[in-house]
């Protein structure tokens, strides 16, 4: 049995898969910040995790996915306010009893040192210095991401 948050995450992922593929994003849109091969957008309001997830999708983006410790540190370096927490795209899957990214992959236990419990209705937030497990209903800010995907020239065989 999936929780409402897991259902919401799956629905958004499926609808994203159904949409026609867009050309690659070469530069970050206005208001977005570039971090390596990603564009990040920091919210200026607060929401529970599932509303944050949905709001990123309205920007044709997703909640932030963090590949490794190095990317976490670089992202945290962009956070200017000490005490502010931001949702990222990671929540606890009750059915699999594990932290699960919204793209369906599981957290590599070495990637993030999470403060707090791994339990039902827990979602992950980051601050300038730490990574926290919070109740998904907590209302905090969030970070959306778009991948920068340089367009490669297609080579067509002679007709």
């Amino acid at each position: 049995q999936k929780s409402s948050i897991e259902k919401c995450s799956v629905d958004i992922q499926q609808s994203r898969n159904k949409t026609t593929e867009r050309p690659g994003l070469l530069n970050c849109p206005i208001y977005w910040q570039q971090l390596r091969e990603k564009c990040l957008l920091f919210s200026h309001t607060v929401n529970p995790w599932n509303n944050s997830l949905a709001d990123c999708s309205t920007k044709e983006s997703s909640l932030l996915l963090i590949r490794d410790k190095d990317e976490l540190i670089h992202t945290q370096n962009l956070i200017r306010d000490k005490a502010i927490l931001f949702w990222i795209g990671l929540n606890f899957s009750l059915s699999e009893k594990n932290w699960k990214w919204i793209n369906g992959s599981f957290l590599n236990s070495n990637d993030l040192e999470i403060r707090g419990d791994a339990k039902e209705n827990s979602c992950i937030s980051i601050s300038q210095t730490s990574v926290y497990s919070e109740y998904c209903s907590t209302e905090i800010r969030w970070i959306c991401q778009k991948e920068l995907t340089p367009v490669r020239n297609k080579v067509y065989p002679d007709s």
Epitope: I30, Y31, T45, P48, N51, D81, E139
Partner: antibody, heavy 120, light 107 residues
Framework: EVQLQQSGPELVKPGASMKISCKAS????????MNWVKQSHGKNLEWIGL????????YYNQKFKDKATLTVDKSSSTAYMELLSLTSEDSAVYYC?????????????WGQGTTLTVSS | DIVMTQSHKFMSTSVGDRVNITCKAS??????VVWYQQTPGQSPKVLID???IRHTGVPDRFTGSGSGTDFTLTISSVQSEDLADYFC?????????FGGGTKLEIK
Amino acid sequence: EVQLQQSGPELVKPGASMKISCKASGYSFTGYTMNWVKQSHGKNLEWIGLINPNTGGTYYNQKFKDKATLTVDKSSSTAYMELLSLTSEDSAVYYCARLGDNYRGYFDFWGQGTTLTVSS
Amino acid sequence: DIVMTQSHKFMSTSVGDRVNITCKASQDVGTAVVWYQQTPGQSPKVLIDWASIRHTGVPDRFTGSGSGTDFTLTISSVQSEDLADYFCQQYSTYLYTFGGGTKLEIK
């Protein structure tokens, strides 16, 4: 047409509390975050805090955390700010102001302001 | 807290003149700066967002520029209705802060 209609001027005694209202019309009330701003001496502007009308989530400027309480009534599309334990320092014009975008901190529509005078 | 300083509290100009209103941030705020106009007895009205993007319906005589710590609002040809206070605001941090305002007076 977007409008934010605030309650009228108030004269209150030191130590009292009071609540200012801000009735929104012309847009989806739950779709935009509401902010409150204090203007002292006709000039100095200070951001007090925000409330997400859809969820009731709030975030305050630490300076006003014990001074202001933000709430909303979705059924009447009205935001409220209660000011507590008033002193002469709280005499000012208070504005509600709509956040223009979830991802940028600017205010695209403002109420007409509510003048608060704290005096014995 | 980031302090936004508008060094000119008053500026006097004539109709048709070009005027530059400046604002200095105490630390780098990128382009997360807004300019507001407050005419006498009215509430503030947004003119410019993201340092240089004119808000919908704002006359093109208003132009914003700058990044980092130094920002300018330019009125290319002042009109009598531009008599107002002008405020800058930063949102680079979540504690939004405003400049002290510049009152534009028409000679």
